[in-house]
Interface confidence: low
């Protein structure tokens, strides 16, 4: 239902964010990814 599509949308967003982060500097990649994973856990 609606929840599933929202989750799918979030995953797509997260995946692009991960790609963007890995393109940037090492330090920011690690720090930002920590925040994303925390956000993902918190959304469950």
């Amino acid at each position: 239902g609606g929840g599933g599509s929202k989750h799918k949308c979030f995953r797509k967003d997260l995946e692009q964010n991960e790609t963007l982060e890995s393109i940037m500097s090492t330090a920011e990649s690690e720090e930002e990814l920590k925040r994303y994973f925390y956000y993902l856990e918190g959304s469950k």
Partner: antibody, heavy 118, light 112 residues
């Protein structure tokens, strides 16, 4: 001091290839994503491509996808842009830029001119 | 793709007077990390672009404090509090929120 110096530009016929290089100095090259941005004469800026600090992730503008490849050699502090099947619309000054913390292109080279003409 | 527009495209200003440039994006530049990846670049005649402002309002190192950035979501502004001769050039906004990264068309600032 932090510096980026592009080279490899020149005049090339349509359909031919050219390889641009960018020599980095004054910072830890292997810790930064690197970009290519171009500017046609008298026009605006167009983002071309980016490569991650480790070379494992790459992304391209649709206008160059399948024709251009981006690579880097962290042992030599060098960024490359291999341009194949060049078109008249690829004529531009090509800048390399450092992708820093906060998703910003903070340091730019002076640019190298690519002219595609028969 | 996110389309960036700027107004005005040309801005003749008087030395010592303020100048303002507007930038609008076709969709929100807020990413899920809460940051807005909007930068301003200056390109003086015959020179490469130079970073002025990142993440809407953060001045890059060495940038004079007469430059300031503001805005949110889709609408952003670059202000020069008192224009100096060295400020002549083209100013671009740029989004790095989403691939492909895109630039505004540029605003030419010159002296009246």
């Amino acid at each position: 001091q932090v510096q980026l110096v592009e080279s490899g530009g020149g005049v090339v016929q349509p359909g031919r290839s050219l390889r641009l290089s960018c020599a980095a100095s004054g910072f830890t090259f292997s810790s930064y994503g690197m970009h290519w941005v171009r500017q046609a004469p008298g026009k605006g800026l167009e983002w071309v491509a980016v490569i991650s600090y480790d070379g494992n992730n790459k992304h391209f503008a649709d206008s160059v996808k399948g024709r251009f490849t981006i690579s880097r050699d962290n042992s030599k502090n060098t960024l490359n842009l291999q341009m194949n099947s060049l078109r008249a619309e690829d004529r531009a000054v090509y800048y390399c830029a450092r992708g820093a913390s906060g998703f910003v292109l903070d340091i730019w080279g002076q640019g190298t001119m690519v002219t595609v003409s028969s | 793709d996110i389309v960036m527009t700027q107004t005005p495209l040309s801005s003749p200003v008087t030395l010592g007077q303020p100048a303002s440039i507007s930038c609008r994006s076709s969709q929100s530049l807020v990413r899920s990390d809460g940051n807005t990846y909007l930068s301003w670049l200056q390109q003086r005649p015959g020179q490469p672009p130079r970073l002025l402002i990142y993440k809407i309002s953060n001045r890059f190192s060495g940038v004079p404090d007469r430059f300031s950035g503001s805005g949110a979501g889709t609408d952003f502004t670059l202000k020069i509090s008192r224009v100096e001769a060295e400020d002549v050039g083209i100013y671009f906004c740029m989004q790095t929120t989403q691939f492909p990264f895109t630039f505004g068309p540029g605003t030419k600032v010159d002296i009246k």
